[in-house]
Interface confidence: medium
């Protein structure tokens, strides 16, 4: 069973990701991952997805984020084309249409990618083995 | 319950130097990162500076970047905030808050004015 091209693209990104460490890293986002244990594998992609949306979509043009150098906009812009590329993949391999987003736990983005990293790598050692 | 108490405010002439200090209670500090923003008179709320739940890094607005400096003491609960240089646009209400994004918890603020 081979493992899917848009994991391979999805790890690859998040490696990228984690690799910055930012202010707009810091900054909170819902911890789908607190209590995930009733919930599918694309569940928990499709809620992800709607996680990154929501951070990019509230902070794309966030002043915080955006900094007054050219270095710091070009960072956040790369920041923001990366997550807009994990969000796109994420609903690639969810295959849903939507998802509720509930929980009052909160994380910053970082380990939110952190998770998330974790967890599609542990879903690439299964399928490669 | 999350309670956040600002001190150290009060009024400095231009050039002059305080040390803003937040003492925080009901959650276990040292597992989250620490941010102080503040208000200026008739104006909206601005970020002023962050620091991660570790202290390994930390980050400042332009307006305060090599002026003002974040720490923390973890043993302490502890959140400080040392102001030099201060000019009379640094006049505000600063206040600590838990984590950065939503900012859910605050504390009641704490006067810093800057005149001659």
């Known amino acids: 069973h081979k493992c899917d091209i848009t994991l391979q693209e999805i790890i690859k990104t998040l490696n990228s990701l984690t690799e910055q460490k930012t202010l707009c890293t810091e900054l909170t986002v819902t911890d789908i991952f607190a209590a995930s244990k009733n919930t599918t594998e694309k569940e928990t992609f499709c809620r992800a997805a709607t996680v990154l949306r929501q951070f990019y979509s509230h902070h794309e043009k966030d002043t915080r984020c955006l900094g007054a150098t050219a270095q710091q906009f070009h960072r956040h812009k790369q920041l923001i084309r990366f997550l807009k590329r994990l969000d796109r993949n994420l609903w690639g391999l969810a295959g849903l249409n939507s998802c509720p987003v509930k929980e009052a736990n909160q994380s910053t983005l970082e380990n939110f990618l952190e998770r998330l990293k974790t967890i599609m790598r542990e879903k690439y050692s299964k399928c490669s083995s | 319950e999350v309670q956040l108490l600002e001190s150290g405010g009060g009024l400095v002439q231009p050039g002059g130097s305080l040390r803003l200090s937040c003492a925080a209670s009901?959650?276990?500090?040292?597992?989250?990162?620490m941010a102080w923003a503040r208000q200026a008179p008739g104006k909206g709320l601005e970020w002023v500076s962050y620091i991660v739940a570790d202290g390994a890094r930390t980050y400042y607005a332009d307006s305060v970047k090599g002026r003002f400096t974040i720490s923390r003491d973890n043993s302490k609960n502890t959140l400080y905030l040392q102001m030099n240089s201060l000019r009379a646009e640094d006049t505000a209400v600063y206040y600590c808050?838990?984590?950065?994004?939503?900012?859910?918890?605050w504390g009641q603020g704490t006067l810093v004015t800057v005149s001659s």
């Open positions: 009901g959650f276990t500090f040292e597992e989250y990162g």
């Open positions: 808050a838990k984590s950065l994004g939503r900012f859910d918890y």
